[in-house]
């Protein structure tokens, strides 16, 4: 069978905490060089389920700044520009990985943390529960 | 500005690569314990800009499995359940941090990488360019 050759240039892993503790190079490699810089930048205003972006800052976290979406309305904007409460604006959430300084205030020691962020909003048909 | 006191229990940072290379504990701490497990799980079907989720797996990346949203239609679903091409379904994208094995196949050495993922779709009013 295939043997995935372990790279001989790998750092030493004889750490007593291995494999829980790993070395991470914080020099970020950005794979998004060919993406449209506009991206979804104006969708928050043009959407039928518009949202506001709130800045969340935490110096003990990496990245320290995260933007959170909050839907502007309970309903969705209809063709007349009014809020239609027969539809619902809901946040689209995603779990993302961040680095949390651990122990606190340490410049070079982190722990992976999973947090839930709202990225934007979408308009959905509500689930109607009929009472018998 | 604020001066964060350095914790005396911090690991040694006399690494020649410091502060680019840090230690990270991969034991994930999940902050989402009180979140609704349903979350946006069915929004992809109920949205007026529905989407499909595609699996992307990569053992050289952490997390190794990422789900990408692809909008089902160019237009949005109207009240009659038909696609209305006067509106546009667009992906809501977010830059997220992942860990990339570096050098490749190394079990305990990573580099931070920024990738752009589509989390879901929203319905927007199109930008109409009028020709003079």
């Amino acid at each position: 069978g295939i043997t995935i050759p372990r790279n001989p240039g790998c750092p030493n892993s004889e750490d007593k905490n291995f494999p829980r503790t790993v070395m991470v190079n914080l020099n970020i490699h950005n794979r998004n060089t060919n993406t449209n810089p506009k991206r979804s930048s104006d969708y928050y205003n043009r959407s039928t389920s518009p949202w506001n972006l709130h800045r969340n800052e935490d110096p003990e976290r990496y990245p320290s700044v995260i933007w959170e979406a909050k839907c502007r309305h309970l309903g969705c904007i209809n063709a007349d520009g009014n809020v239609d409460y027969h539809m619902n604006s809901v946040p689209i959430q995603q779990e993302i990985l961040v680095l949390r300084r651990e122990p606190p205030h340490c410049p070079n020691s982190f722990r992976l943390e999973k947090i839930l962020v709202s990225v934007g909003c979408t308009c959905v048909t509500p689930i109607v529960h009929h009472v018998a | 500005g604020i001066t964060i006191p350095r914790n005396p229990g911090c690991p040694n940072s006399e690494d020649k690569n410091f502060p680019r290379t840090v230690m990270v504990n991969l034991n994930i701490h999940n902050r989402n314990t009180n979140t609704n497990p349903k979350r946006s799980s069915d929004y992809y079907n109920r949205s007026t800009s529905p989407w499909n989720l595609h699996r992307n797996e990569d053992p050289e990346r952490y997390p190794s499995v990422i789900w990408e949203a692809k909008c089902r239609h160019l237009g949005c679903i109207n009240a009659d359940g038909n696609v209305d091409y006067h509106m546009n379904s667009v992906p809501i994208q977010q830059e997220i941090l992942v860990l990339r094995r570096e050098p490749p196949h190394c079990p305990n050495s990573f580099r931070l990488e920024k990738i752009l993922v589509s989390v879901g779709c929203t319905c927007v009013t199109p930008i109409v360019h009028h020709v003079a």
């Epitope: 069978g1 295939i2 995935i4 | 797996e57 053992p59 692809k70």
Partner: antibody, heavy 124, light 110 residues
């Protein structure tokens, strides 16, 4: 030695059923996703189905969807392919193959171990 | 018809370099790493290259792979008689939700 051994092939009439087995040895079977791939006489390789390491997820080629079922018994280190409503175009050598990366992967690092194949002939 | 397109045949004399292309789309090669398989007549396929350009142990370094955009290629340098075989590219396809193989290329050593 890592090995996959298919069995259960044979000659069958159109519309009938057949069950293929693939016995695995030499690796921790329950850690790997598994595939079935077929090759019609004189033709190229055609992917049939994949099953996740724990059997919770399965995907099929459109040509076999609704007729074939992939399954596994990790306690017996065995992969199965249940083939119903067989057609002449299902005639092929059927190979089972193992995913290269261990864990929740369907295709990562390729299909690194293949069986020798078992022949299925659908003919009246 | 395969969603991954390969030339039906390629040939070269011993010692030469032969290249095989594999063309796909954004739903397959555009998003997933490509694998290459070698199949000699009468035998089961063998993994030759994985993750776009990595060789499993035991595969000679005469074989190299690359991937860019929606296409991939396999190069065989210093062609030898034992390289005479069928070669298939393969990857995952998001639209079909499955693993897909290329149409195959028969390499002949003249």
């Amino acid at each position: 030695e890592v090995q996959l051994l298919e069995s259960g092939g044979g000659v069958v009439q159109p519309g009938r059923s057949l069950r293929l087995s693939c016995a695995a040895s030499g690796f921790i079977f329950s850690n790997y996703g598994m595939h079935w791939v077929r090759q019609a006489p004189g033709k190229g390789l055609e992917w049939v189905a994949v099953i996740s390491y724990d059997g919770s997820n399965k995907y099929y080629a459109d040509s076999v969807k609704g007729r074939f079922t992939i399954s596994r018994d990790n306690s017996k280190n065995t992969l199965y392919l249940e083939m119903n409503s067989l057609r002449p175009e299902d005639t092929a050598v059927y190979y089972c193959a193992k995913v290269g990366a261990s864990g929740d992967y369907y295709y990562s690092y390729g299909l690194d171990v293949w069986g020798q194949g078992t022949t299925v002939t659908v003919s009246s | 018809q395969s969603v991954l397109t390969q030339p039906p045949s390629a040939s070269g004399t011993p010692g030469q370099t032969v290249s095989i292309s594999c063309s796909g789309s954004h739903s397959n090669i555009g998003r997933h790493p490509v694998d290459w398989y070698q199949q000699v007549p009468g035998a089961a396929p063998k993994l030759l290259m994985y993750y776009g350009g990595y060789r499993p142990s035991g595969v000679p370094d005469r074989f190299s792979g690359s991937q860019s955009g929606t296409s991939a290629s396999l190069a065989i340098s210093g062609l030898q008689s034992e390289d005479e075989a069928d070669y298939y590219c393969a990857t995952w396809d998001d639209r079909l939700v499955g693993y897909v193989f290329g149409s195959g290329t028969k390499v002949t050593v003249l």
